[in-house]
């Protein structure tokens, strides 16, 4: 009679993570008597996957009933496959022996490859805000995919970026892989509404790439421009001075009026107006009673934006241009929450 052969018909099997892998194995003869065992790997360091004689195998089931006397099908199914299950599986026939069964014949092996989807890309930006014209770095990470081949692209508002570096780890063979990419982005004043997108394409995604996004509103700081102007006389001996704070982001802003270097009033930007580009404008004003001053008055609008060092703009009020009237050196009434009289 022809000697028993162990047939593993599939050289390789490809399974998606979470699915069930079927590893096929048949024997050509019932003789010699003895059990079948399945191993992952070869040699002394192999891992025992299934033992016909004994053991507990929560994820492994046999395709046919191995207790049947004439059974020659030793195929197994492994459920809930993960990338860690990848490897070459050998179906091995043992000959009954005493005290131990003796390995008799091995199949040629079936390589199990596991396709695992990458995790959703996570994009993170710099810890501190940066101003326009500065270059900032964004990182994108995705993990747990297999096989190793993967494509990563960066976009800013739909436009593909080219200044980035990508690494896939580990370099050698592994059950699953991770990708890490760093992109450099130059900020512009119009970037409050901009988005940076990291796009990952992998064979497991069937042409529907995964995307991670970061809003530049969390990264950018647009410093304000200041303009101090003197409005036409509102009433006799009164001048309205306004400080226009334009095109700033984020909204956090504190304004202080100084009269000849002395603090007159401090206020926090509240009712701002939003520009189309996402930046904000705000205006503060002072009502100045010029008749109370003998000398010129230096008015300074000082703005502290988003915790940054203060910027300021000054305006000189020429008192001599307004002839004094008798009895007009009393304080004028405040006519609004943003108004202040100097006296």
């Amino acid at each position: 009679e022809e000697e028993l052969q162990v047939i593993q018909p599939d050289k390789s099997v490809l399974v998606a993570a979470g699915e069930t892998a079927t590893l096929r194995c048949t024997a050509t003869s019932l003789i010699p008597v003895g059990p079948i065992q399945w191993f992952r790997g070869a040699g002394p360091g192999r891992e025992l996957i299934y033992n016909q004689k004994e053991g507990h195998f929560p994820r492994v089931t046999t395709v046919s009933d191995l207790t049947k006397r004439n059974n020659m099908d030793f195929s197994i199914r492994i459920g809930n496959i993960t990338p860690a299950d990848a490897g070459t599986y050998y179906c091995v026939k043992f000959r009954k022996g005493s005290p131990d069964d003796v390995e008799f014949k091995s199949g040629a092996g079936t390589e199990l490859s596991v396709r695992a989807k990458p995790s959703a890309p996570v994009v993170s930006g710099p810890a501190a805000r940066a101003t326009p014209q500065h270059t900032v770095s964004f990182t994108c990470e995705s993990h747990g995919f297999s096989p190793r081949d993967i494509t990563l692209k960066w976009f800013k508002n739909g436009n593909e970026l080219s200044d980035f570096q990508t690494n896939v780890d580990p370099v050698g063979e592994s059950v699953s892989y991770s990708i890490h990419s760093t992109a450099k982005v130059v900020l512009t004043r119009e970037d409050v509404h901009s988005q940076v997108i990291c796009e990952v394409a992998h064979v497991t995604l069937q042409g529907d790439p995964l995307r991670g996004t970061a809003n530049l509103s969390e990264t950018i700081r647009v410093p304000p421009t200041l303009e101090v102007t003197q409005q036409p006389v509102r009433a006799e001996n009164q001048v309205n001075v306004t400080c226009q704070v334009r095109k700033f982001y984020p909204q956090r802003l504190q304004l202080t009026w100084l009269e000849n270097g002395n603090v007159s009033r401090t206020e926090t930007a509240s009712t701002v107006t939003e520009n189309k580009d996402g930046t904000y404008n705000w205006m503060s004003w002072l009502l100045v009673n010029v008749s109370a001053h003998r000398d010129d008055v230096k008015l300074t609008c000082q703005v502290e934006h988003d915790g940054q060092p203060a910027v300021s703009k000054s305006h000189d009020l020429k008192v001599s241009a307004h002839p004094k009237e008798q009895g007009s050196n009393t304080a004028a009434e405040n006519t609004g929450s943003n108004e202040r009289n100097i006296y």
Epitope: E47, L48, Y50, G55, H56, F57, P58, R59, D85
Partner: nanobody, 124 residues
Framework: QVQLQESGGGVVQAGDSLRLSCVAS????????MGWFRQAPGKEREFVAG????????YYADSMKGRFTISRDNAKNLVYLQMNSLKPEDTAVYYC?????????????????WGQGTQVTVSS
């Protein structure tokens, strides 16, 4: 060289549960098959349970099947033995063992490394 350190032993009442842990260091944990053994006073060391390196296959001594569960966490280099419905006859020193090769309940013969053991006492 592999270092093994057991923990989780103690004194419990019959019918109670206990979970033993064993942390391994000194070698790639996922390349080791792991097992638990026990030795009661005046008796030989006996096999309790074994688990293959990926955790896919597990083996139990007949007297512990259904009551004891072996598991492992390769990310943390840990192997566990969950013991339920404990009996006074489960009183023993429990040892963790690591093997470079694994053949089911042949594990005692194949174990290359042993821990110091943790005492489990089950009172009636």
């Amino acid at each position: 060289q592999v270092q093994l350190q057991e923990s989780g032993g103690g004194v419990v009442q019959a019918g109670d549960s206990l979970r033993l842990s064993c942390v391994a260091s000194g070698r790639t944990f996922s390349s080791l098959d792991m097992g638990w053994f026990r030795q009661a006073p005046g008796k030989e060391r006996e096999f309790v349970a074994g688990i293959s390196r990926s955790g896919i296959s597990q083996y139990y001594a007949d007297s512990m099947k259904g009551r004891f569960t072996i598991s492992r966490d390769n990310a943390k280099n840990l192997v566990y033995l969950q013991m339920n419905s404990l009996k006074p006859e489960d009183t023993a020193v429990y040892y963790c063992a690591a093997a470079l090769t694994f053949r089911g309940s042949d594990l005692p013969r194949d174990s290359n490394y042993w821990g110091q053991g943790t005492q489990v006492t089950v009172s009636s």
